[in-house]
């Protein structure tokens, strides 16, 4: 799994846009089975916040044991706390489930910082505010962990929604979503609307607040505005995509587009930040610093270590630039762009000092494992993980935080040549390349 404020462990060659309009596929295409526009029972089924992750309620076992489970598109294991831990209010008790089956196999998942390990089994799983189905799924019962569970996060497990290729211990362990699609009539697609609050939430506020929606098996048209634009899933392991151009306030970073995807670019709801490869991060920060130079910030702010606080109500959003990522489109030589605001990449944090300050951390950070479009990106958009058609859709989220002057955007089409050259081909060595 990716790392660096990676939850749960964790806190180009593109040409300039041209006037030429290319045909595009949006939701004008025929509706497919299961893609009806309203999924009332699933709307608002997520809670949480970007810094600690978004979670959905799930039940495991017979009789059902209710747990809150982190929604993570950057991993592929369904793993739940199965032993007492100081940060867990509750945990999966296998001995109380009549439907639990032991697979007599262990699993060990190390991260750059921390790890979890456990025992593999299967049990009956359902999602109360999801499709009305029960599936037998693989479950890693976490018996030991280090720096995995987050104090006060209110989740007790993780739902890895990516593909089998990155499942642990190996790709033979079927991920939950594969099991769901195989055993039911749920279409092979899910969509996420993560709603950042725009201000820090204390524990009781998180419990009371809506964090967003995970629509399993379809698209809910009430959760977005405008059109959905799709980018191909380059390879089915992580949700890998290709970025072809990056702009800060409309100014092209002018880097070889391979740099943007070195060594990959993924969409990951389990990572807090927008994480960028070192060279790209440095160029982006230089550009953001220049745009916001009317204010002086400590170096630690740009490293994500230090918060800055404005008098409550006076955050100068206007001095910070918008950031646009151009993604490969579905049509040859066509791209589209997603644009986020500082309201997404400045993450509100509780200041211990005073409630009369609005404090933020810079939520763009450096990565050694490629670009990670984490919660700060996803909070601007409704994101459709269309596994059936091997593509990811983006539309402006109906719940994104903005001001009266600017809004997040999804726009296209733009003519961009040689986009295939933007992808980086990771040298194939052994399986240890997945160890991060």
């Amino acid at each position: 799994t990716q790392h660096g404020i990676r939850l749960p462990l964790r806190s180009g060659l593109g040409g300039a846009p041209l006037g030429l309009r290319l045909p595009r596929e949006t939701d004008e295409e025929p509706e497919e089975p299961g893609r009806r526009g309203s999924f009332v029972e699933m709307v608002d089924n997520l809670r949480g916040k970007s810094g600690q992750g978004y979670y959905v309620e799930m039940t495991v076992g017979s009789p059902p044991q209710t747990l809150n489970i982190l929604v993570d598109t950057g991993s592929s294991n369904f793993a739940v706390g199965a032993a007492p831990h100081p940060f867990l209010h509750r945990y999966y008790q296998r001995q109380l489930s009549s439907t639990y089956r032991d697979l007599r196999k262990g699993v060990y998942v190390p991260y750059t910082q921390g790890k979890w390990e456990g025992e593999l089994g299967t049990d009956l799983v359902s999602i109360p505010h999801g499709p009305n189905v029960t599936v037998r799924a693989n479950i890693a019962a976490i018996t030991e962990s280090d720096k995995f569970f987050i104090n006060g996060s209110n989740w007790e497990g993780i739902l890895g929604l990516a593909y089998a290729e990155i499942a642990r211990p190996d790709d033979s362990l079927e991920p939950f979503f594969d099991s769901l699609v195989k055993q039911t009539h749920v279409p092979n697609l899910f969509s996420l609307q993560l709603c950042g609050a725009g201000f820090p939430l204390n524990q009781s506020e998180v419990l009371a607040s809506v964090g967003g929606s995970m629509i399993i098996g379809g698209i809910d048209h009430s959760l977005y505005t405008g059109s959905l634009w799709y980018t191909p899933i380059r390879r089915e392991w992580y949700y890998e995509v290709i970025i072809v151009r990056v702009e800060i306030n409309g100014q092209d970073l002018k880097m070889d587009c391979k740099e943007y995807n070195y060594d990959k670019s993924i969409v990951d709801s389990g990572t807090t930040n927008l994480r960028l490869p070192k060279k790209v991060f440095e160029a982006a920060v230089k550009s953001i610093k220049a745009a916001s130079s009317t204010e002086k910030f400590p170096d630690g702010f740009w490293l994500g270590e230090q918060l800055v606080c404005w008098q409550a109500g006076t955050t100068p959003w206007n001095i910070f630039p918008v950031i646009s990522l151009y993604l490969m489109g579905e049509v040859t030589n066509q791209s589209f762009r997603i644009t986020i605001l500082p309201q997404q990449y400045l993450r509100p944090v509780e200041d211990v000092a005073t409630s009369q300050d609005d404090c933020y951390k810079f939520a763009i950070s450096q990565s050694s494992t490629g670009t990670v479009m984490g919660a700060v990106i996803m909070e601007g958009f409704y994101v459709v993980f269309d596994r059936a058609r091997k593509r990811i859709g983006f539309a402006v989220s109906a719940c994104h935080v903005h001001d009266e002057f600017r809004t997040a955007a999804v726009e296209g089409p733009f003519v961009t040549l040689d986009m295939e050259d933007c992808g980086y081909n990771i040298p194939q060595t052994d399986e240890s390349t997945l160890m991060t």
Epitope: P298, V308, C309, Q311, A312
Partner: antibody, heavy 119, light 107 residues
Framework: EIQLQQSGPELKKPGETVKISCKTS????????MTWVKQAPGKGLKWMGW????????IYADDFKGRSAFSLETSASTAYLQINNLENEDTATYFC????????????WGQGTTVTVSS | DIVLTQSHKFMSTSVGDRVSITCKAS??????VAWYQQKPGQSPKLLIY???TRHTGVPDRFTGSGSGTDYTLTISSVQAEDLALYYC?????????FGGGTKLELK
């Protein structure tokens, strides 16, 4: 030019009330918080608290809760410090200071108002 | 409360000298430190904030440095007008506290 102009010196008796004004100019008053700092004769600087000039909400340091009150007259770009039930220990120079933009450093200061409490 | 200790109450110097005034915090204040200069009968003037950022109009002979708990204000070449009282202040958490001050005087 940014300026913070404080009211003149005050001579008060114990038990009385004093109200000091701090009139600002040269910037948007409601964008920057206003801090109050006490300096007793021959002593160092002590942070009394601050007031959010956008919301009007005051924050007091523990040692100054109870008898001190910060207020605003936004239309006049003026902040006020009132100290009730004065004691001899309140004899000091009081400074208003504009809080910095991104943190609580104090970038511009008034000239200070000396308050003497004596029976 | 975070305590700031300026170990030298007085420092003697000569015009043209390089002088360093130190400030130690009782806990890590993550470079949230400011420095002020105060002359007799005047209000303090901000010199440095965020440990090393020079305030508008402050001569470049004044530099701030440090991290964690240890911070320094350096005057590269002392001028006669620099003889004054210098205070450090932490803007990390409430209550925002000041050091006891260091008086820079002529030898």
């Amino acid at each position: 030019e940014i300026q913070l102009q404080q009211s003149g010196p005050e001579l008060k008796k114990p038990g009385e009330t004093v109200k000091i004004s701090c009139k600002t100019s040269g910037y948007t008053f409601t964008t920057y918080g206003m801090t109050w700092v006490k300096q007793a004769p021959g002593k160092g600087l002590k942070w009394m608290g601050w007031i959010n000039t956008y919301s009007g909400v005051p924050i007091y340091a523990d040692d100054f809760k109870g008898r001190s009150a910060f207020s605003l007259e936004t239309s006049a770009s003026t902040a006020y410090l009132q100290i009730n039930n004065l004691e001899n220990e309140d004899t000091a120079t009081y400074f208003c200071a504009r809080r910095g933009s991104t943190a609580h450093y104090f970038d511009y200061w008034g000239q200070g108002t000396t308050v003497t409490v004596s029976s | 409360d975070i305590v700031l200790t300026q170990s030298h109450k007085f420092m003697s110097t000569s015009v043209g000298d390089r002088v360093s005034i130190t400030c130690k915090a009782s806990q890590d204040v993550s470079t949230a430190v400011a420095w002020y200069q105060q002359k007799p009968g005047q209000s303090p003037k901000l010199l440095i904030y965020w440990a090393s950022t020079r305030h508008t109009g402050v001569p470049d002979r004044f530099t701030g440095s440090g991290s964690g708990t240890d911070y320094t204000l350096t005057i590269s070449s002392v001028q006669a007008e620099d003889l004054a009282l210098y205070y450090c202040q932490q803007h990390y958490s409430t209550p925002y506290t000041f050091g006891g001050g260091t008086k820079l005087e002529l030898k």
